[in-house]
Each structure stands twice: as structure tokens, then as C-alpha cells.
């Protein structure tokens, strides 16, 4: 079972090798594509391969922008040529996403497929790191192989690679380990029950919040650190502002996603730029501890 | 390795019908666009039907729009014609082709080794 | 529906020739042409797809180049086995062949 997803990728190429890509759809060149092109073909170490978010089968929407749907094969591969001179390609690529049935905690076993020249699209963090502790992924690129396994989401710990244990072993040491990895990765991973945002812990609710600007202020202060997995919480209300007025937000409250982007695995400051950039509406999803009124 | 085998030609009276098939293996039959492509005795090749891979499109020349009906059972491997209102001038090697789209170009890489229809009373 | 003629419509050569065939679209079909091969009571096989790129496992002596109407398949020095009849194939449009070439031994 798998579900859909999109995303954005940037590759850069020249005239002459172009970007590694191949798209199919139709069965001639003119023919008005009624589904979007396919990838149907990924060059070895081509920019299309070595950016690790791409794979045969993938839909390709838009190109630089255009959409691809209703127009033809011919025009697709014009697009591509003529973004080969300007040597960049912007791509928005719809994927398959497995449905893993995955526990919210325990340890299990993640095999990723993998090339020398690929990434895997995970990024490790050693936050706070206490000797002993483990690695912690802090960000799976989207599109990439790790991320379409559907079982890694950032705040798992990550305790080996290919039997290799990571208990002391320095984060640049785990990054060079899984860069030379070839063919499949194994690895050990270790989800615990606090990296669940979904899991309504004890004494604890989440909820969704809107707020519509109409121009003015959120009138609220948050707080955090640049440390990937410390909470985001609301320090600051400003008085009758329109946070406030909603009664549903409180200094103290916990900030899990803004616009339903995950603050999990992100710092303050993305959690701030997520806030500045958020349009009109504003959905900000809540996790509130119940020892005080709602 | 690819083949492809065609079966189902023979004599039919004109007006007749008849229904060729052709049992695909060594590659994922659902991934390709596949072709019926035709020469009549003695002339050149002829294109004459295609399908898309989840057979969701079909394409066909105008000679024999409306008579012809190309399908494709993916769970068999097996690609179909069928032939309807069958004229002299149907008369033909029938050949079955794999049809790809590589490197800006559509092309028939890999063809059955036909089988011979005859229209004629 | 776009046109595809082929010239000569036959030829005689020797083994060791350099022969070159010539395909026209009546209308521009960018690289869209494939050239194939086929001997008498055979199917025909694939050589050149996309105007000049060689089909996997086909001899080096054939080369195809052109783009737009006029397309050139050449046979840089003529083998035994060559002499067969060849065509041309667009996919700009829904697929159309030309009426093939006939390569004979002299």
C-alpha cells in the first residue's frame, strides 16, 4: 500500500550531457499527454542520480514551472533541453510513499538501497549528544530512498549501520560509514514513545488551531533553541492580540506543526520562518498539558 | 531474454473475423507500449495498432479504425488484435512489437516473428 | 499524416562499399526517426534510434545522422550480411515507415 507525495527538485546540468533524465508518456512525440511523463530512465552518476530524489517511475508535474499534463512529449523534452542551457532544472515530482506498518516505539531493522554516489536523503544529528547516547535522525530529505521506505521520520534513534554499533561512535564517523555503504544499508533503529507527536501522552491533549490575520499580528512569542528536538512552545501572549482572544492558546503550550509542516526535528528559527511566511491563515497544531483548564 | 510469439493467422473469407495474439516473456509486459505493425506480400511495413502498457490508450491507423480492436492482458503476457470486417488488402505478415520510448525517440526494439493472415474467398 | 520517402528505392554495392540512404519527412519530425533492417522471411530488427544513436549490439559501421526532414543512414564498409532491405520510421506523429530500401550485391 502506498500513498502519494511531491516534492521540488533542483538539479544543475550542461548543454551537453544535459541532466541524466528521461521521461516517457504517449506513444508519439505530439501526442497531447493525457497523465503526466514518467521517469522512465536515470543515467549513472548523472545529476538526476547523484541527487538522490529521483526514481524510475516518478510523475513529473511540472518543469521550471510548466506543467507537464495536457501538453506533449516533444514539449516536455524542449523544456528539459532549454533548461540544460540555463544549466538548471527545476522539477515538482510526484512519488509513491510506502504505508508502513511501523510501532509508535520499540527497535526494529530499515533496509535502504544504495549507491556509492547517492545519498540516502538522512540527516544525523548528535544533539546535546551525552557520550553513550545515541545518534538521532533530525531530517529525512523528501523524495529521497530513506524517506520512501515510509518507516523513518526524523527523531528516531539511529543505533547502527550494517551491524556496525554507533553507541560511541562520533557523528562525522556514522556520516562517513553511511556514505560508503553500497548496494543495501542496514539499519538499527530505536523509536521511543516522546518522538510520537500523534501519541497523546498522559495528561495531554493536541488540537488544531486557525487564525486569520486580516493583516495584523499572530500576538504570540515563541520559544525554543537550535537544538533540532527541544520543544517549540508559546512564551508570550500579546494582550487582547489575536491569539489571545481565541482562548484556545496559552503561554506554556507546546507548537507541533505550523500549516501542518511538522516542527518536529526543527529548530526555533525554522519554526520562526515557518511563522513569517505563513500567509493569511494561519493552522497552528497545539499540544497542551491538561493540569490546567483548557 | 525478450520474445515475442504470434499465433492466430490463417484463411478467413473476406467480411470475416479472426484474432491474432501475442504471448510476450523476458521483460515486465506492464511497463511497455506494445504494436501491431503488418507487410503485406511482396511491400513495405505497416503500422497498424498500439496500447499503452496499462492498456489504458489504444491507437490505430485510419485503414483500419473501427474494424480493428488492439487489448492487452497484462496478468497473461499476452497482447490481441482483433480483426472484424476482414478485407483482401488486410491480407499480411502480422507482426507483434515491443514499442519504447529511449533518448527522444519511440522505436520498435524488439519484434515476433509473425504470423500470416490471408483474407480471400 | 506525415510522409516518409526513402531514396534510392534499391541499390547495388560491393562488400567493403561505403552505401548511404536517404529518408525525407514531408514535415519536421525533430530526431523522432528510427532506421531498421530486414532480411527476407525475418522480422526486421532495430539499428538506429533517435536519428543517430546506435541500437545495442548493432555493428559500429552503421551510423545514422540528420534531424528535422532530411535523415542519412550510412554503412561505412559493406559486409556480407548487410544486404537486406532498410526503413525508415518516424514517432513524431503516430508512427509512419518509409517505403524501404533494397541493398543488393552488385
Known amino acids: 500500500i502506498v500513498h502519494t507525495e511531491t516534492t521540488e527538485v533542483v538539479l544543475c546540468g550542461d548543454p551537453l550531457s544535459g541532466f541524466g533524465l528521461q521521461l516517457q508518456g504517449g506513444i508519439f512525440a505530439t501526442e497531447t499527454l493525457s497523465s503526466p511523463p514518467l521517469v522512465c530512465f536515470i543515467e549513472p552518476d548523472s545529476p538526476a542520480e547523484r541527487c538522490g530524489l529521483l526514481q524510475v517511475g516518478d510523475r513529473v508535474l511540472s518543469i521550471n514551472g510548466i506543467a507537464t499534463e495536457d501538453g506533449t512529449m516533444e514539449e516536455a523534452n524542449q523544456l528539459l533541453r532549454d533548461a540544460a542551457l540555463a544549466h538548471k532544472v527545476v522539477l515538482e515530482v510526484e512519488f509513491d510513499v510506502a504505508e508502513s506498518v511501523i510501532p509508535s516505539s520499540g527497535t526494529f531493522h530499515v533496509k535502504l538501497p544504495k549507491k556509492r554516489s547517492v545519498e540516502l536523503g538522512i540527516t544525523i544529528s548528535s544533539a546535546s549528544r551525552k557520550r553513550g547516547e545515541p545518534l538521532i535522525i533530525s531530517d529525512i530529505k523528501k523524495g529521497s530512498v530513506a524517506h520512501r521506505t515510509g518507516t523513518l521520520e526524523p527523531g528516531d534513534k539511529l543505533l547502527a549501520i550494517d551491524n556496525i554499533r554507533l553507541d560511541n561512535c562520533p557523528m562525522e564517523d556514522a556520516v562517513q560509514i553511511l556514505r560508503q555503504c553500497e548496494d543495501l544499508v542496514k539499519l538499527k533503529i530505536r523509536k521511543d514513545e516522546d518522538n510520537s507527536d500523534e501519541l497523546e501522552t498522559t495528561g495531554a491533549v493536541s488540537y488544531t488551531v486557525e487564525l486569520k490575520r486580516y493583516g495584523g499580528p499572530l500576538g504570540i512569542t515563541i520559544s525554543g533553541t537550535e537544538e533540532p528536538f527541544d520543544p517549540i512552545v508559546i512564551s508570550g501572549l500579546t494582550k487582547r492580540g489575536l491569539a489571545e482572544r481565541t482562548g484556545a492558546i496559552h503561554v506554556g503550550d507546546r507548537i507541533l506543526a505550523i500549516n501542518n509542516v511538522s516542527l518536529k526535528g526543527r529548530p526555533l528559527s525554522e519554526a520562526i520562518h515557518l511563522l513569517q511566511v505563513a500567509g493569511e491563515t494561519v493552522t497552528l497544531k497545539i499540544k497542551k498539558q491538561l493540569d490546567r483548564p483548557l | 531474454e525478450v520474445q515475442l510469439l504470434e499465433s492466430g493467422g490463417g484463411l478467413v473469407q473476406p467480411g470475416g473475423s479472426l484474432r491474432l495474439s501475442c504471448a510476450a516473456s523476458?521483460?515486465?509486459?506492464?511497463?511497455?507500449?506494445m504494436s501491431w505493425v503488418r507487410q503485406a506480400p511482396g511491400k513495405g511495413l505497416e503500422w497498424v495498432s498500439a496500447i499503452s502498457g496499462s492498456g489504458g490508450s489504444t491507437y490505430y491507423a485510419d485503414s483500419v479504425k473501427g474494424r480493428f480492436t488492439i487489448s492487452r492482458d497484462n496478468s497473461k503476457n499476452t497482447l490481441y488484435l482483433q480483426m472484424n470486417s476482414l478485407r483482401a488488402e488486410d491480407t499480411a505478415v502480422y507482426y507483434c512489437a515491443r514499442y519504447v520510448y529511449y533518448s527522444y525517440s519511440y522505436s520498435f526494439d524488439y519484434w515476433g516473428q509473425g504470423t500470416l493472415v490471408t483474407v480471400s474467398s | 499524416d506525415i510522409q516518409m520517402t526513402q531514396s534510392p528505392s534499391s541499390l547495388s554495392a560491393s562488400v567493403g562499399d561505403r552505401v548511404t540512404i536517404t529518408c525525407r519527412a514531408s514535415?519536421?519530425?525533430?530526431?523522432?526517426l528510427n532506421w531498421y533492417q530486414q532480411k527476407p522471411g525475418k522480422a526486421p530488427k532495430l539499428l538506429i534510434y533517435?536519428?543517430?544513436s546506435l541500437q545495442s549490439g548493432v555493428p559500429s559501421r552503421f551510423s545514422g545522422s540528420g534531424s528535422g526532414t532530411d535523415f542519412t543512414l550510412t554503412i561505412s564498409s559493406l559486409q556480407p550480411e548487410d544486404f537486406a532491405t532498410y526503413y525508415c520510421?518516424?514517432?513524431?506523429?503516430?508512427?509512419?515507415f518509409g517505403q524501404g530500401t533494397k541493398l543488393e550485391i552488385k
Open positions: 514535415q519536421s519530425i525533430s530526431s523522432y
Open positions: 533517435a536519428a543517430s
Open positions: 523476458g521483460f515486465t509486459f506492464s511497463s511497455y507500449a
Open positions: 520510421q518516424q514517432s513524431y506523429y503516430l508512427p509512419t
